[in-house]
């Protein structure tokens, strides 16, 4: 077992708003559970946008899920990772981190 | 270390306004995690009332309708509740709690108010 | 709303066994779960959270598992001190909803 290393990043999105992206990469097996949490449960899955898990040449695999926020909501969102029976919350940066 | 911890009276009315207040040490209420109500009725059920949020916004429990508000007052570093038009079976021991954002689970709770609802 | 169902609603052990109580959800919540442990006029105390994971200082015979809606809290050679009432917590969306508990007796 590689467990992922996760990461999230901001980017600015139509004014007010803020896409938040949560990546996973450098795991093995492949099966990983990576979602946003919003208040401290599930957001619901038609607002979050999942990428594929993928292959990344290194007998590893990535992938990731994005949501769109409000712009200084930042801090009601983390994103939830769960891999190989481990898991972990990681919360949005803060702006200019 | 935080310390959350509960105040109001023990006897309320019927058709009365139940109002509690919850006084928080060692954390601001406004720096982060969400400020809970709790409710146990006698028999032992819990049920999540609603809470406050470090933003100040609310969500509360759909069963309690329009009869409950959570407010805060950030300078005292105190959260409230007020539950309007009380019944004998809003009768339970209160508790209020914190949780984070990682997960809504409650580490972190005041001891009970017991809240008798009675003529 | 999602439903919690605790079973059993009592029981009785001695010390040194092995207790299971289990937690029904009324829809799938995805490991969205917490277990409390609540003594006689006191407050609930955290035990699990993510349905997996021990809370700070909780002493390892406690162990939770399950997946989908199907959870359980194992409590290996049970002690003395681990008397008391017992619930689940989902926090997969709001409403918020605990389990009715089940009472651990020492026999």
């Known amino acids: 077992t590689v467990p992922p290393m996760v990461n999230v990043t901001r980017s600015e999105a139509s004014e007010g708003n803020i896409t938040v992206t949560c990546r996973a990469s450098s795991f093995y097996p492949r099966n990983i559970i990576l979602t946003w949490r919003q208040d401290g449960v599930s957001l619901s899955h038609d607002t979050q946008q999942w990428g594929d898990v993928l292959p990344d040449g290194n007998g590893t695999y990535q992938t990731w899920v994005a949501t769109r926020i409000c712009r200084g909501e930042e801090q009601r969102f983390t994103c939830y990772m769960e891999h190989s029976g481990n898991h972990s919350t990681h919360p949005v940066p803060s702006n200019g981190s | 270390d935080v310390q959350l911890q509960g105040s109001g009276p023990g006897l309320v009315k019927p058709s009365q306004s139940l109002s509690l207040t919850c006084s928080v040490t060692?954390?601001?209420?406004?720096?982060?995690y969400y400020w809970n109500w709790i409710r146990q009725f006698p028999g032992n059920k819990l049920e999540w009332m609603g809470f406050i949020s470090f933003g100040g916004s609310n969500n509360y429990n759909p069963s309690l309708k329009n009869r409950i508000s959570i407010t805060r007052d950030t300078s005292k570093n105190q959260f409230f509740l007020k539950l309007s038009s009380v019944t004998t079976e809003d009768t339970a021991t209160y508790y209020c709690?914190?949780?984070d954002g990682r997960g809504a689970w409650f580490a972190y709770w005041a001891q009970g108010t017991l809240v008798t609802v009675s003529a | 709303d999602i439903q919690m169902t605790q079973s059993p609603a009592s029981l009785s052990a001695s010390v040194g066994e092995t207790v299971t109580i289990t937690c029904r959800a009324s829809?799938?919540?995805?490991?969205?779960l917490a277990w409390y442990q609540q003594k006689q006029g006191k407050s609930p105390q955290l035990l699990v959270y993510d349905a997996i994971t021990l809370a700070d200082g909780v002493p390892s015979r406690f162990s939770g598992s399950g997946s989908g809606t199907q959870y359980s809290l194992k409590i290996n050679s049970l002690q003395p001190e681990d008397f008391g009432n017992y619930y689940c917590q989902h926090f997969w969306s709001f409403p918020l909803t605990f389990g009715a508990g089940t009472k651990v007796e020492i026999k």
């Open positions: 709690a914190r949780y």
């Open positions: 060692g954390y601001s209420i406004t720096n982060d």
């Open positions: 829809g799938n919540i995805h490991n969205y």
